[in-house]
Amino acid sequence: AVNGTSQFTCFYNSRANISCVWSQDGALQDTSCQVHAWPDRRRWNQTCELLPVSQASWACNLILGAPDSQKLTTVDIVTLRVLCREGVRWRVMAIQDFKPFENLRLMAPISLQVVHVETHRCNISWEISQASHYFERHLEFEARTLSPGHTWEEAPLLTLKQKQEWICLETLTPDTQYEFQVRVKPLQGEFTTWSPWSQPLAFRTKPAALGKDT
């Protein structure tokens, strides 16, 4: 294959983007490399330039079309190649057949907003971005709430086992600042993984009502 240990990992966002990371121990940082995508049943092909993200890894996004266009289906197979320049020619470093709908990672949910907030609860909604209509309702979500004095890693995960783009957070403390994040995952796919977490939504619960005698 290639000298040193190499890894080539790609994910499809279900619409018009394949994001790839290629890593190789001992590779030169200034090496010029590309990813080429050749679908088995499409007339187009696409290339992106791998750019360094760390000492021994490179990443790029194959932009297949307009963000919401459905460029691939469940029956497509895309041959992905990593090519690196050696002098005047390109050398193939890796070849992978990639089934897009077995390797899904959606975009992070967007448009988070507070629908209604009270002293002890808060209703939040969001939208999914650039997600294929093929999923219909076959999506799940994870959410987490950052409480004062805690880290995101400590926040318990709330699982929504259906396509539900809202949540009602309960047992909150009055007059307290919180942050909320959500991520999404399709139910299908051998290597399908969670989307990145959404941008955090900050909100504050309402203060407790003052007693009549105070």
Partner: nanobody, 127 residues
């Protein structure tokens, strides 16, 4: 007893195609990553292709130049290797192999990663 049985080899002309099959028995097929290796006379065994348990990713040796396609049919407990535009340098004994450990399909596995091997099928490409 676990068995991998290759078939489909033979003598072909340069430029022809050939499809190798590897039928398995005695194992839970969908729990195994599967691969193809080849060994030419006087040379060491060489990686050709490997596919993950569900077939979502398949890695190919650079030497295949995109001429080979590895696929699996989890209903028929069979893995295939379609070889197009064959060249004399493709002449070798082709082996099917199964890997019990998890394979992500993102790197080139070594022959030592595979636990179960078939007996091989001879492919000869004449010029």
């Amino acid at each position: 007893q676990v068995q991998l049985v290759e078939s489909g080899g033979g003598l072909v002309q340069a430029g022809d195609s050939l499809r190798l099959s590897c039928a398995t028995s005695g194992l839970t097929f969908s729990s195994y990553a599967l691969g193809w290796f080849r060994q030419a006379p006087g040379k060491k065994r060489e990686f050709v292709a490997a596919t993950t348990r569900g077939g979502g990713r398949t890695m190919y040796a650079v030497s295949t130049e995109g001429r080979f396609t590895c696929s699996r049919d989890n209903d028929k407990n069979t893995v295939y290797l379609l070889m197009n535009s064959l060249k004399p340098k493709d002449t070798a004994v082709y082996y099917c192999a199964a890997m019990t450990s998890y394979y992500s399909g993102t790197y080139y596995p070594d022959s030592s990663d595979f636990d179960i091997w078939g007996q091989g099928t001879q492919v000869t490409v004449s010029s």
